[in-house]
């Protein structure tokens, strides 16, 4: 097997709980986190399962702004603009990694957290449960 | 903006580029990744804009496996199962954070990276460009 050398070029950790506490470089490629998804596409308006985007802001979290999709209708929009309740608008969810300040208000100490966000909506055929 | 106090209980940072490099506690909340509500839906099959999930694997990244949605059709599926090409299936994209070891093989040093993933597909009315 490969024995990984404790590289002299590696940041050193004095933390007793090492490696539970690590250094993370936030100098991200493509760092503009709060890009409003409305700007990148208008699918949220043109979809047969349209959604509204709600700004979820938390200064104790990185990224501090996350956009949450909320489906506008229970049903799906037909070509004539009316809602078809024989179909369902449902949120598409994605689990994402975020950093949360811990202890709170410490500028350079974070905890890794997983959260579930709704990214947009899609129109699905409902599951019909037949009663025997 | 919020002025974050330099809390005496906070870990100290000697980094000149602070807060570009931060300390992260890896005791993740919701570590139990295998109990993901998102995993249990079959919207990808039941959607009027169904999609297939393709594996994007990178052993030097966490998460090592990310699933990319690829819309099955250019159009959207009608109630009779046929595809309506007057409508478009389009991918809904989301920017997510991933962790990458940097320098490689350093056990306590990571870099946060942003990647754009397609989470699922939605059915939209096409934009019609009229020629003068």
């Amino acid at each position: 097997g490969i024995a990984i050398p404790r590289n002299s070029g590696c940041p050193n950790s004095e933390d007793k709980n090492f490696p539970r506490t690590v250094m993370v470089n936030l100098n991200i490629h493509n760092r503009n986190t709060s890009t409003n998804p409305k700007r990148s596409s208008d699918y949220y308006n043109r979809s047969t399962s349209p959604w509204n985007l709600h700004r979820n802001e938390d200064p104790e979290r990185y990224p501090s702004v996350i956009w949450e999709a909320k489906c506008r209708h229970l049903g799906c929009v037909k070509a004539d603009g009316n809602v078809d309740y024989h179909m369902n608008s449902v949120p598409i969810q994605q689990e994402i990694l975020v950093l949360r300040r811990e202890p709170r208000h410490c500028p350079n100490s974070f905890r890794l957290e997983k959260i579930l966000v709704s990214v947009g909506c899609t129109c699905v055929t409902p599951i019909v449960h037949h009663v025997a | 903006g919020i002025a974050i106090p330099r809390n005496s209980g906070c870990p100290n940072s000697e980094d000149k580029n602070f807060p570009r490099t931060v300390m992260v506690n890896l005791n993740i909340h919701n570590r139990n990744t295998s109990t993901n509500p998102k995993r249990s839906s079959d919207y990808y099959n039941r959607s009027t804009s169904p999609w297939n999930l393709h594996r994007n694997e990178d052993p030097e990244r966490y998460p090592s496996v990310i699933w990319e949605a690829k819309c099955r059709h250019l159009g959207c599926v009608k109630a009779d199962g046929n595809v309506d090409y007057h409508m478009n299936s389009v991918p809904i994209q989301q920017e997510i954070l991933v962790l990458r070891r940097e320098p490689r093989h350093c056990p306590n040093s990571f870099r946060l990276e942003k990647i754009l993933v397609s989470v699922g597909c939605t059915c939209v009315t096409p934009i019609v460009h009229h020629v003068a």
């Epitope: - | 139990n32 990178d58 962790l99």
Partner: antibody, heavy 117, light 106 residues
Framework: QVQLVQSGAEVKKPGSSVKVSCKAS????????ISWVRQAPGQGLEWMGS????????NYAQKFQGRVTITADESTSTAYMELSSLRSEDTAVYYC??????????WGQGTLVTVSS | DIQMTQSPSSLSASVGDRVTITCRAS??????LNWYQQKPGKAPKLLIY???SLQSGVPSRFSGSGSGTDFTLTISSLQPEDFAVYYC????????FGQGTKVEIK
């Protein structure tokens, strides 16, 4: 090509503990989890728990909670599974497997643990 | 825990036969279903992941289908090296395996 090489067979007394090792050769652990799966003689497969060596995150099956401890040493690319308070029904082949958190794509050769008085 | 039920528990078939094994989950698991092959004294081998994706290096005679609660593994033309035990496994929740299906020579 990733290979997982496990430690040799063990014979243990009831009430004792066993620690099985799993060494990744031909590559590091990378960012995958390592899961432990056991198989009693003539029986099916049973997942016990997992660890992500990069972070030290562990996740245990309810059934083994409190009795199993999974650890990893990145410097030697080795994962360990320790099972305590052994009983005869723990006699099984114990496998480690590389776990993408979606499937197990590489497996160790297995370690037979026999619990007998 | 999500229970996985395979059927049949064993089957006899001849070389060249088309073989189908089914797996049912006690609740919906989307497509998070894998299939493994295990030969006597050996570790399991991943054949199919995410219900229908063929793992690299696995012959194309193996295919998987299904979504939600019902899944199928098909071997289109059984070869001598395919006689083994086959397991389904879900990863929608903490992993659980089916009880196995033994494919024997007729």
């Amino acid at each position: 090509q990733v290979q997982l090489v496990q430690s040799g067979a063990e014979v243990k007394k009831p009430g004792s503990s066993v620690k099985v090792s799993c060494k990744a050769s031909g590559g590091t652990f990378s960012s995958y989890a390592i899961s432990w799966v056991r198989q009693a003689p003539g029986q099916g497969l049973e997942w016990m728990g997992s660890i992500i060596p990069w972070f030290g995150w562990t996740n245990y099956a309810q059934k083994f909670q409190g009795r199993v401890t999974i650890t990893a040493d990145e410097s030697t690319s080795t994962a360990y599974m320790e099972l305590s308070s052994l009983r005869s029904e723990d006699t099984a082949v114990y496998y480690c497997a590389r776990d993408s958190e979606y499937y197990f794509d590489h497996w160790g050769q297995g370690t037979l643990v026999t619990v007998s008085s | 825990d999500i229970q996985m039920t395979q059927s049949p528990s064993s089957l006899s078939a001849s070389v060249g036969d088309r073989v189908t094994i089914t797996c049912r989950a006690s609740q919906g698991i989307s497509n998070w279903l894998n299939w493994y092959q295990q030969k006597p004294g050996k570790a399991p081998k991943l054949l199919i992941y995410a219900a229908s994706s063929l793992q690299s290096g696995v012959p194309s005679r193996f295919s998987g289908s299904g979504s939600g609660t019902d899944f199928t593994l098909t071997i289109s033309s059984l070869q001598p090296e395919d006689f083994a035990v086959y397991y389904c496994q879900q990863y929608s929740d903490d992993p659980t395996f089916g009880q196995g299906t033994k494919v024997e020579i007729k």
